[in-house]
């Protein structure tokens, strides 16, 4: 008996071939001997089976002695033995229909679990193997689970169901809902405008939810909510914003926040959360602001940074085109009695400059100028 595997919702074509290459009498029945379809000459006729509105054939093949049974929109319960009767012969085909579905939704939040469930006909013993977009293989029986979904798990999962040495392949598109970056750092000189961007790592037709940015300033004892907003069909509307600082927010995606000026009291870490409609859990992105200030008070030239800096960052003060006068893994450096000229304060990581502030030191008889 020939075995054919089908996928739930798909179309399958069961073949039946006569030795005569012409249109002759044929009919298809199920295992209960109920007629599904056949012909009356060149006309198609259908029997009283439950497949009636989903069963079909292909007229153009009849003249070649081929009398297919086409079953559309396959259901698990279509799994059966189908019998084609033609030229006093019977051809039997066993159809096994499988379905593979993702738990509740194919749009999942980063960190959530994905469960794939296999629907199979009674009496079958299939094995399943799935390959994630990043090449990770998982195997299982009726259910397969992947915990702690990551951004790289977004994309097409390819699952192969094996039964009777035959296989059928399912492709399931999984969207992991997350921000493109888990964390970002913005480096700014005091007084500069600050732009925070929170691009999403996915695109959906309609995006609705609400969000909030909580900020923990380095100088503050507790965190506070800087802004709350709503998202409706990718349109952003601000609900509430603090007076200090007075943030501005873009009306369109990606989520975009503007801080009018970087000040030492704003340096710190923020956590933007986004709760999406019909989803349990929230998306998170951490954002950090590092602010630099270079000042000259009397005979002291000082460079300071505020905010979350890593201990390996180097803060330096140097006269333009000269070697660094002072260079330390600290958040403040200074030079006493600096020479006149253009001084540079540099925050660098392994030689790469992250932030730079220039200050002009005038000869001692005049006051300093900050460009």
């Amino acid at each position: 008996k020939k075995v054919v595997l089908g996928k739930k919702g798909d179309t399958v074509e069961l073949t039946c071939t006569a030795s005569q290459k012409k249109s002759i009498q044929f009919h298809w029945k199920n295992s209960n001997q109920i007629k599904i379809l056949g012909n009356q000459g060149s006309f198609l006729t259908k029997g009283p089976s439950k497949l009636n509105d989903r069963a079909d054939s292909r007229r153009s093949l009849w003249d070649q002695g081929n009398f297919p049974l086409i079953i559309k929109n396959l259901k698990i319960e279509d799994s059966d033995t189908y019998i084609c009767e033609v030229e006093d012969q019977k051809e039997e085909v066993q159809l096994l229909v499988f379905g593979l579905t993702a738990n509740s939704d194919t749009h999942l939040l980063q960190g959530q679990s994905l469960t794939l469930t296999l629907e199979s006909p009674p009496g079958s013993s299939p094995s399943v193997q799935c390959r994630s977009p990043r090449g990770k293989n998982i195997q299982g029986g009726k259910t397969l689970s992947v915990s702690q979904l990551e951004l790289q798990d977004s994309g097409t999962w390819t699952c192969t169901v094996l039964q009777n040495q035959k296989k059928v392949e399912f492709k399931i598109d999984i969207v992991v809902l997350a921000f493109q970056k888990a964390s970002s750092i913005v480096y700014k000189k005091e007084g500069e405008q600050v732009e925070f961007s929170f691009p999403l790592a996915f695109t959906v037709e309609k995006l609705t939810g609400s969000g909030e940015l909580w900020w923990q300033a380095e100088r503050a004892s507790s965190s506070k909510s800087w802004i709350t907003f709503d998202l409706k069909n990718k349109e952003v509307s601000v609900k509430r914003v603090t007076q200090d600082p007075k943030l501005q927010m873009g009306k369109k995606l990606p989520l975009h926040l503007t801080l009018p000026q970087a000040l030492p009291q704003y340096a710190g870490s923020g956590n933007l959360t986004l709760a999406l409609e019909a989803k349990t859990g929230k998306l998170h992105q951490e954002v950090n602001l590092v602010v630099m200030r270079a000042t000259q008070l009397q005979k002291n030239l000082t460079c300071e940074v505020w905010g979350p800096t890593s201990p390996k960052l180097m803060l330096s003060l140097k006269l333009e085109n000269k070697e660094a006068k002072v260079s330390k893994r600290e958040k403040a450096v200074w030079v006493l009695n600096p020479e006149a000229g253009m001084w540079q304060c540099l925050l660098s990581d392994s030689g790469q400059v992250l932030l730079e502030s220039n200050i002009k030191v005038l000869p001692t008889w005049s006051t300093p100028v900050q460009p």
């Epitope: 249109s23 009356q40 198609l44 007229r59």
Partner: antibody, heavy 117, light 107 residues
Framework: QVQLVQSGAEVKKPGSSVKVSCKAS????????MHWVRQAPGQGLEWMGW????????GYAQKFQGRVTITADESTSTAYMELSSLRSEDTAVYYC??????????WGQGTLVTVSS | DIQMTQSPSSLSASVGDRVTITCRAS??????LAWYQQKPGKAPKLLIY???SLQSGVPSRFSGSGSGTDFTLTISSLQPEDFATYYC?????????FGQGTKLEIK
């Protein structure tokens, strides 16, 4: 060569019946289905029903169910279509058509049935 | 019942013209469609079966295409003998309905 020769024109009164014959020649009569199609004056084609002369099985369009009977006489290779309870709107040319391997490939010349009081 | 809708219902053309007649089914009929030609006072003649197969003896200027719900009959270069009425018929589900016909006239 294949030929389907139909009986002559008929004039019938409303409420009566008509029986149109279709004599087949040039092929094995029982080996092919026979269909009946009608065409009212100036109108399109309308399928009425079919018959398998080998088994005697028939199928009719719902519209004619209970009024039409298709029969066959194997000995004379003749198919018949009888329509009862005639009304004026049954005035039409009635055709028999053989269903060959490809489709209804041979047709009779048609029989005009006029229903008039 | 499956409804078959032909368009246009009438068409004027000249000898040598390329003509297309369309037929639309109210539901998917796969390729179970035939085209017929009928001349006044005559029985219909089978031109195309299985949507695109040319019946034996029919000139190759006639061709059919389509599948599912939309079908076309094309006459590549009209000849004087082609002026007639054309019908489509579905053979997918009883009652095996015809289209209302397309009358092809000389311009």
């Amino acid at each position: 060569q294949v030929q389907l020769v139909q009986s002559g024109a008929e004039v019938k009164k409303p409420g009566s019946s008509v029986k149109v014959s279709c004599k087949a020649s040039g092929y094995t009569f029982t080996g092919y289905y026979m269909h009946w199609v009608r065409q009212a004056p100036g109108q399109g084609l309308e399928w009425m029903g079919w018959m398998n002369p080998n088994s005697g099985n028939t199928g009719y369009a719902q519209k004619f169910q209970g009024r039409v009977t298709i029969t066959a006489d194997e000995s004379t290779s003749t198919a018949y279509m009888e329509l009862s309870s005639l009304r004026s709107e049954d005035t039409a040319v009635y055709y028999c058509a053989r269903d060959g391997v490809t489709g209804t490939d041979y047709w009779g010349q048609g029989t005009l049935v006029t229903v008039s009081s | 019942d499956i409804q078959m809708t032909q368009s246009p219902s009438s068409l004027s053309a000249s000898v040598g013209d390329r003509v297309t007649i369309t037929c639309r089914a109210s539901q998917d009929i796969n390729d179970f469609l035939a085209w017929y030609q009928q001349k006044p006072g005559k029985a219909p003649k089978l031109l195309i079966y299985a949507a695109s197969s040319l019946q034996s003896g029919v000139p190759s200027r006639f061709s059919g295409s389509g599948s599912g719900t939309d079908f076309t009959l094309t006459i590549s270069s009209l000849q004087p003998e082609d002026f007639a009425t054309y019908y489509c018929q579905q053979s997918y589900s009883a009652p095996y309905t015809f289209g209302q016909g397309t009358k092809l006239e000389i311009k």
